[in-house]
């Protein structure tokens, strides 16, 4: 069983899923309002968003005193965060600016990918090896969308029987999408294109918030029960509480290299020939050069206009 990394508003914590009755280890303390969290295991980095400080920050696993600011301007409510461990990029959602953005892992070369038809974007999940990203939107027209990580091929994949889609996670081995709905109180799964939808846990969960997966087990935080729960990812059986008495459980991830499988990085050689951003793409050559917001890509498709 994995270590579970979760945001707890005031801090980030790690808890052993097999021994959740033990106290969780505080990874980073003294925080204001930590909401989203993710990591790049191979780089030893943990990222989180703070919705009160309107910032995205990071630390190194073994140097928790060294907190670095990554993105500190132009954020209002960065509710969702995801690390592209292959392309070494950071993606985030902001439910007040109504944007989905991407940058380098250090926050540089920031680009707005989506800014239209977003209402309350929340959870975001990446599949770098296929070049797709997924996000939930719990706004007036709730939905789950998929798009290329380069901003292409945007498509609504779930828009029925959905109300407050909060948690979202991907099963890379089985090519499935899992999500939790806090109003309809369920966990459902589907194929990555939204087809073959099935209930995993039928509507009985008080207020599921964030969702993660490790091997055959789903783990999620619940705002109402102040706990982390788990069940079998196929059947929903074996529902159990593995860690309780959490101050304010927010985002959660299975903290393991297994959740960030290695694959060929199409941007790996010479940044794909891109002068600035090289983003994963679902279509050949499986990457796309891109420029920071406000800077034009030249006709060669590789170089950003001078002054970027």
């Amino acid at each position: 069983a994995p270590l579970l990394l979760y945001a707890n508003r005031r801090d980030l914590r790690l808890v052993d899923a097999t021994n959740g009755k033990e106290n969780a280890t505080i990874v980073v303390g003294g925080l204001e309002d930590a909401a989203a969290v993710d990591f790049v295991f191979s780089h030893g980095l943990i990222y989180w968003s703070d919705v009160s400080e309107e910032a995205i920050k990071r630390t190194e696993f073994n140097k928790t005193e060294s907190v670095q600011n990554v993105v500190v301007s132009g954020l209002l409510s960065p509710d969702g965060l995801a690390c592209d461990w292959l392309g070494e990029k950071l993606y985030w959602t902001d439910s007040e600016t109504n944007r989905i953005e991407v940058s380098n892992l250090d926050g540089s070369l920031r680009k707005v990918l989506f800014w239209q038809e977003l209402d309350q974007p929340r959870a975001i999940a990446l599949d770098p090896s296929s070049g797709f990203m997924y996000w939930t939107d719990w706004g007036e027209v709730p939905k789950i969308e998929r798009a290329g990580m380069d901003g292409s091929s945007r498509f609504i994949i779930i828009n029925s029987e959905i109300y407050w889609p909060n948690g979202l996670t991907l099963d890379y081995e089985e090519q499935k999408l899992y999500w939790a709905d806090a109003k309809l109180n369920f966990i459902h799964k589907s194929n990555l294109d939204g087809t073959n939808r099935q209930a995993v846990v039928k509507g009985s969960l008080p207020h599921p918030f964030a969702l993660t997966l490790f091997e055959d087990i789903l783990y999620w935080t619940d705002w109402s029960t102040h706990s982390i729960l788990a069940c079998n990812k196929y059947t929903g059986e074996g529902l159990r509480e593995i860690h309780s008495d959490i101050f304010s459980p927010m985002d959660i991830h299975a903290f393991s290299q297994q959740r960030q499988p290695n694959a060929t990085n199409p941007c790996g050689i010479d940044n794909g020939g891109c002068s600035h951003l090289c983003l994963m793409s679902p279509v050949k050559p499986f990457y796309q050069c891109a420029c920071p917001t406000g800077v034009k890509l030249l006709e060669n498709g590789k170089t950003c206009k001078d002054g970027a």
């Epitope: 109180n185 039928k202 509507g203 008080p206 029960t225 729960l229 529902l239 008495d245």
Partner: antibody, heavy 119, light 107 residues
Framework: QVQLVESGGGLVQPGGSLRLSCAAS????????MHWVRQAPGKGLEWVSV???????YYADSVKGRFTISRDNSKNTLYLQMNSLRAEDTAVYYC?????????????WGQGTLVTVSS | DIELTQPPSVSVAPGQTARISCSGD??????VHWYQQKPGQAPVLVIY???NRPSGIPERFSGSNSGNTATLTISGTQAEDEADYYC??????????FGGGTKLTVL
Amino acid sequence: QVQLVESGGGLVQPGGSLRLSCAASGFTFSVNGMHWVRQAPGKGLEWVSVIDGMGHTYYADSVKGRFTISRDNSKNTLYLQMNSLRAEDTAVYYCARYDYIKYGAFDPWGQGTLVTVSS
Amino acid sequence: DIELTQPPSVSVAPGQTARISCSGDNIGSKYVHWYQQKPGQAPVLVIYGDSNRPSGIPERFSGSNSGNTATLTISGTQAEDEADYYCTRTSTPISGVFGGGTKLTVL
């Protein structure tokens, strides 16, 4: 062990009021949804009200505007304030925990307290 | 709200299998739970989440749920199983639906 004990039932005249209590022990009361269910003499079970772990309250249409559910987490106690009582409110009133680990089953139930509305 | 319909009564000989149905529109999309109530006592949970048995409930109790019908099955029924049985379905946050109840008589 997990236990619920109701009290406060009794005989009351139509139009009168009564407050039922349900003392909980053996579990983390504050995070659990708690329900009131009643059973009129010789009849089936009828759901009355719930207060969830976040404090949201809901009522059956038959009691809306007359009954108020509340909780005191510091005392591990659930309440049902019943006003403007009618003869048809005569029933045994049970409190029950919404067990989210059991997919939302009511478990356990209290032993019940009898409310009789009669002149 | 979905109405849950149960037969008012079911009779079974000792040692035989009793089946109590609970029907409702697309009930299979919700979790169904079953309670046993003996005279003068509070209800006791015997099946939760369609087919799970709480600890202390004999193995002869089982449940299933799909489509428009959930079923409580009591295999090798014993005299002590004579009671009223109620189905309900999880419907957060209200959870306001109980079946009308079935009186199980062991002949």
